[in-house]
Amino acid sequence: APFDDDDKIVGGYNCEENSVPYQVSLNSGYHFCGGSLINEQWVVSAGHCYKSRIQVRLGEHNIEVLEGNEQFINAAKIIRHPQYDRKTLNNDIMLIKLSSRAVINARVSTISLPTAPPATGTKCLISGWGNTASSGADYPDELQCLDAPVLSQAKCEASYPGKITSNMFCVGFLEGGKDSCQGDSGGPVVCNGQLQGVVSWGDGCAQKNKPGVYTKVYNYVKWIKNTIAANS
């Protein structure tokens, strides 16, 4: 493996318990994707995380243990973006309506949608229960966190020639070693208190010159608001 440190997310750290109160786990008998609570009844995730039946788990830290702060709520509606493209992963975004309202408290709360696009160099928080090994597999029980900067669109496109659309952006480190990975999909990229990204894809994980690629939430604010209004 190119990086032999005690990998978390890959190269991150154990989040402080319930310090990411908007983070949710999507469960279909097991955790398969992350998501972000954007209001009491709606979650944003990745389009490629679509399944016909999903249980949304809020207030989680250790997904293998009932710790007392969890809220398990079934999805009532699962709405993938109408222009989602499974080949290019363009428009990789999805909305989930909860069958009942989440109880908002110190350990379960919402994250704001962006008011401006992500600025190059901005430090963001990426979180999830995905693979913590850049090679092989090591799935954590506890939520992992990673602080990482937004990369310029030029560097992003240079890393993945011909594959980056205007609905995608890169976050991470070109030197490798720190990245999101399998199991983090759909999870949040939060910059300055706003949900700027959704974990989407990458070539491998934490590889040199292959940063993580994220759905640019800013481009979908209108769609999110319209969809919520039409399904309330």
Epitope: Y30, A46, H48, S180, G183, G186, W201, G202
Partner: antibody, heavy 128, light 108 residues
Framework: QVQLVQSGAEVKKPGASVKVSCKAS????????MHWVRQAPGQGLEWMGS????????NYAQKFQGRVTMTRDTSISTAYMELSRLRSDDTAVYYC?????????????????????WGQGTTVTVSS | EIVMTQSPATLSVSPGERATLSCRAS??????LAWYQQKPGQAPRLLIY???TRATGIPARFSGSGSGTEFTLTISSLQSEDFAVYYC??????????FGGGTKVEIK
């Protein structure tokens, strides 16, 4: 059709090396992990290691560390497993197997790994 | 290293009967578990992945269940072609990838 075709049976003397090849066809070779598994006569399956054909990065089981080398030639979609300093207890059938999880342009959903395609096996006999 | 333990080592069953094979992990592997069937002189064949998802072309009589540390492969009504050795394998934490020791399903 997706398949893995391995090289033929080998008979080696103790202390020698053996190199087994595994030619992939019907899919993008660089997109998937390739693993090597062996099975001694009458025994179970034993994982030896894997190679990422895109990067060439390898993972080896500790038991084989220092004795095994996994390589690939992307131009001919072939993976290789070389085992050195052979002993009689290395007598086994050696298999290559593909993990269907994409390495390139991979979605970061939790993957469901498995060995979906196996080579036919290569019998390696180590005898003096 | 995660140790996978299969039981029983040998299962004697009559054709048409139900067979239940067990696989236990030394620590949680979530749902990152696969089952294989191997017949003499042949390479293993993937039956189940993700603990419960049947691989392409696998008959519905094969089903997998469980998560965490306890897993089961059930063959609802054994056919003559089902007599073979079955292996479980975890993908939750590797290297190393680890297999169970196998369960031989033989004709009673």
């Amino acid at each position: 059709q997706v398949q893995l075709v391995q090289s033929g049976a080998e008979v080696k003397k103790p202390g020698a090396s053996v190199k087994v090849s595994c030619k992939a066809s019907g899919y993008t070779f660089t997109g998937y992990y390739m693993h090597w598994v062996r099975q001694a006569p009458g025994q179970g399956l034993e994982w030896m290691g894997s190679i990422n054909p895109s990067s060439g990065g390898t993972n080896y089981a500790q038991k084989f560390q220092g004795r095994v080398t996994m390589t690939r030639d992307t131009s001919i979609s072939t993976a290789y497993m070389e085992l050195s300093r052979l002993r009689s207890d290395d007598t086994a059938v050696y298999y290559c197997a593909r993990d269907p999880v994409l390495l390139l342009r991979q979605q970061r959903i939790l993957h469901e790994s498995a060995f979906d395609i196996w080579g036919q096996g290569t019998t390696v006999t180590v005898s003096s | 290293e995660i140790v996978m333990t299969q039981s029983p080592a040998t299962l004697s069953v009559s054709p048409g009967e139900r067979a239940t094979l067990s696989c236990r992990a030394s620590q949680s592997v979530g749902s990152n578990l696969a089952w294989y069937q191997q017949k003499p002189g042949q390479a293993p064949r993937l039956l189940i992945y993700g603990a419960s998802t049947r691989a392409t072309g696998i008959p519905a009589r094969f089903s997998g269940s469980g998560s965490g540390t306890e897993f089961t492969l059930t063959i609802s009504s054994l056919q003559s072609e089902d007599f073979a050795v079955y292996y479980c394998q975890q993908f939750h934490n590797w290297p190393p990838l680890t297999f169970g020791g196998g369960t031989k399903v033989e004709i009673k």
